[in-house]
Interface confidence: low
């Protein structure tokens, strides 16, 4: 539908509050280092301009594209070159190159200070003094640290953030009310950011076809009663939404997401029986709820897949006529029958099926050639099943912290060139798969575990892409989206790695460790563990365990000492010497 003014169209569709919030998110995700006040000023200028276009769509510049308007506005920032360096060169380009250039400069690991949570009373005072600024600051701080955060979902988080403060700042015990809610929002926010990052990586690195295949599989699992045509329509619309958000088109994305939620709710009878509750909620909650809705029950009388995809004499004819549609139907039919499989496994099966048809439909006897294609699926299914079984057993035996440590050692030996903070962050997240998924029954373990691991390994891939140091990581990250996890699983100890020089400073600790939270103390210990493995990649589990046990005892002892700093200095030297001896350093 044609609109004289795109900016007026989106302002009217979204309303002023959402329009301003989304423009702030967009600007903060592009210019991640800019001060809050500068962004607020830019957003206010854009909003005032949008209002003039709403009043008169023919007014000057109202016909310009959003990329042109927003890019022009970002390029007015005076300190662009000194703050962002070569990103300023983007401003010399025309659209769409300029926007592509801004996108390429988004930084997954910006050099920003850690967000420190103030005292509850301080936060409540700030909330009451100026609620609007307080909430804008939340959007700004999250968006600049997570430049691919799914913008309409961030509006939902902000709504919950506001609700938490509204409720808890008038509670008798403000802290008891507020802190658990903020912890939950923080953890959910990190997970949401990582999930969206994978969607954007999928679109940007592997293209629309890869994303659509993922969406066909996931939506077919979720809506197994929906017809293929219905699933295809949802996939096309969902792809458009995510392409827009990943491309920085946040107003279009939020608008189209709202339209998609509306469509799903208007057609829920032909989509899923599980949508009723979601569809009774307000817009932001509705969209979130639909995205998280449980899988509908599978239709009872689904016929065997073999009839249409192996036994039929028309397999090659159907495949040749419309390859992507036929493969899409295969994926849909397989996925709706297998809510117990991970999406990445379903995509591996579809890829195997495609490869087989490519080969066999050119053969003398195609049917004879592809007759056993389903037998090729067995090892592909068993590999993740066995891996999850082994790792859940290890998790149940060790508990989360020690399971994370086992993964830290495993991954540091595989890719020792990767930076220590990245190895710690990624291995800690990999280790969380245990508490997240091992509690589930067999039928839910694989989709939980393997699809979660895809999200975490994507974090490794995007962090590594910024400063590539390991050919093995690059290879696993770029060769195949669906085979990333098997690729990393298959890596053995890197025999080419030259151990890091021993540096006593790395293993020198101070009394400040005693005041850290349990989580931060764990990170300190895990950082030391990674460094140990980098110094001594051939160290055995037993050797590393002995050193780590000594280290834990040393921290505990010195944190109880009267003169903590002296204890850390003297006992630390002894610990380093003992560790060197134990590891033969």
């Amino acid at each position: 539908d044609a609109h004289k003014s795109e900016v007026a169209h989106r302002f009217k569709d979204l309303g002023e509050e959402n329009f301003k919030a989304l423009v702030l998110i967009a600007f903060a995700q592009y210019l991640q280092q800019c001060p809050f006040e500068d962004h607020v000023k830019l957003v206010n200028e854009v909003t005032e301009f949008a209002k003039t276009c709403v009043a008169d769509e023919s007014a000057e510049n109202c016909d310009k594209s959003l990329h042109t308007l927003f890019g022009d506005k970002l390029c007015t920032v005076a300190t662009l070159r000194e703050t962002y360096g070569e990103m300023a060169d983007c401003c010399a380009k025309q659209e769409p190159e300029r926007n592509e250039c801004f996108l390429q400069h988004k930084d997954d690991n910006p050099n920003l200070p850690r967000l420190v949570r103030p005292e509850v009373d301080v936060m409540c005072t700030a909330f009451h003094d100026n609620e609007e600024t307080f909430l804008k600051k939340y959007l700004y701080e999250i968006a600049r640290r997570h430049p691919y955060f799914y913008a309409p979902e961030l509006l939902f988080f902000a709504k919950r953030y506001k609700a938490a403060f509204t409720e808890c700042c008038q509670a008798a015990d403000k802290a008891a009310c507020l802190l658990p809610k903020l912890d939950e929002l923080r953890d959910e926010g990190k997970a949401s950011s990582a999930k969206q990052r994978l969607k954007c990586a999928s679109l940007q690195k592997f293209g629309e076809r890869a994303f659509k295949a993922w969406a066909v599989a996931r939506l077919s699992q979720r809506f197994p009663k929906a017809e293929f045509a219905e699933v295809s329509k949802l996939v096309t619309d969902l792809t458009k939404v995510h392409t827009e958000c990943c491309h920085g088109d946040l107003l279009e994305c939020a608008d189209d997401r709202a339209d998609l939620a509306k469509y799903i709710c208007e057609n829920q009878d032909s989509i899923s029986s599980k949508l009723k509750e979601c569809c009774e909620k307000p817009l932001l909650e509705k969209s979130h709820c639909i995205a998280e809705v449980e899988n509908d029950e599978m239709p009872a009388d689904l016929p065997s897949l073999a009839a249409d995809f192996v036994e039929s004499k028309d397999v090659c004819k159907n495949y040749a006529e419309a390859k992507d549609v036929f493969l899409g139907m295969f994926l849909y039919e397989y996925a709706r029958r297998h809510p117990d499989y991970s999406v990445v496994l379903l995509l591996r099966l579809a890829k195997t099926y495609e490869t087989t048809l490519e080969k066999c439909c050119a053969a003398a006897d195609p049917h004879e050639c592809y007759a056993k294609v389903f037998d090729e699926f067995k090892p592909l299914v068993e590999e993740p099943q066995n891996l999850i079984k082994q790792n859940c057993e290890l998790f149940e035996q060790l508990g989360e912290y020690k399971f994370q440590n086992a993964l830290l050692v495993r991954y540091t030996k595989k890719v020792p060139q990767v930076s220590t903070p990245t190895l710690v962050e990624v291995s800690r997240n990999l280790g969380k798969v245990g508490s997240k998924c091992c509690k589930h029954p067999e039928a839910k373990r694989m989709p939980c575990a393997e699809d979660y691991l895809s999200v975490v390994l994507n974090q490794l891939c995007v962090l590594h892409e910024k400063t590539p140091v390991s050919d093995r990581v690059t290879k696993c990250c770029t060769e195949s989206l669906v085979n990333r996890r098997p690729c990393f699983s298959a890596l053995e100890v890197d025999e080419t790695y030259v151990p890091k020089e021993f540096n006593a400073e790395t293993f020198t600790f101070h009394a400040d460790i005693c005041t850290l939270s349990e989580k931060e103390r764990q990170i300190k210990k895990q950082t030391a563990l990674v460094e140990l493995v980098k110094h001594k990649p051939k160290a055995t589990k037993e050797q590393l365990k002995a050193v780590m046990d000594d280290f834990a005892a040393f921290v505990e002892k010195c944190c109880k000492a009267d003169d903590k700093e002296t204890c850390f200095a003297e006992e630390g030297k002894k610990l380093v010497a003992a560790s060197q001896a134990a590891l033969g350093l």
Epitope: E6, S65, L66, H67, T68, E95, P96, E97, N99, E100, F206, G207, E208, R209, A210, K212, T236, T239, K240, T243, E244, H247, D249, E252, A322, K323, D324, V325
Partner: nanobody
Framework: EVQLVESGGGLVQPGGSLRLSCAAS????????MSWVRQAPGKGPEWVSA????????RYAESVKGRFTISRDNAKKTLYLQMNSLKPEDTAVYYC????????GSQGTQVTVSS
């Protein structure tokens, strides 16, 4: 850098035909859906048609359905728009874009339908 260069526009009588081309460079053309967008004088951009990365899935605005056909040749990194039964209201500058965005940045190609 991303470049999209349209060609094939011109002056044509009502009922006539034109074939527009869009040559792409600087990105993995075969991995992205593409669209045609047009902008008539004094109006905002209007989405015309889209095609998915493989060329299997095509979509059209109601105003052009049955008259326009979108296609692509991934080997040649080129997008096409075959326009038949042209009407005066099809007069506009036509742009190709990545994805289904109506944002435009290339020069476009002018199509004028007039007797």
């Amino acid at each position: 850098e991303v470049q999209l260069v349209e060609s094939g526009g011109g002056l044509v009588q009502p009922g006539g035909s034109l074939r527009l081309s869009c040559a792409a460079s600087g990105f993995t053309f075969g991995s992205f859906g593409m669209s045609w967008v047009r902008q008539a004088p004094g109006k905002g951009p209007e989405w015309v048609s889209a095609i998915d990365s493989g060329g299997a899935d095509t979509r059209y605005a109601e105003s052009v359905k049955g008259r326009f056909t979108i296609s692509r040749d991934n080997a040649k990194k080129t997008l096409y728009l075959q326009m038949n039964s042209l009407k005066p209201e099809d007069t506009a500058v036509y742009y190709c874009t990545i994805g289904q965005s109506t944002s435009r940045g290339s020069q476009g190609t002018q199509v004028t339908v007039s007797s």
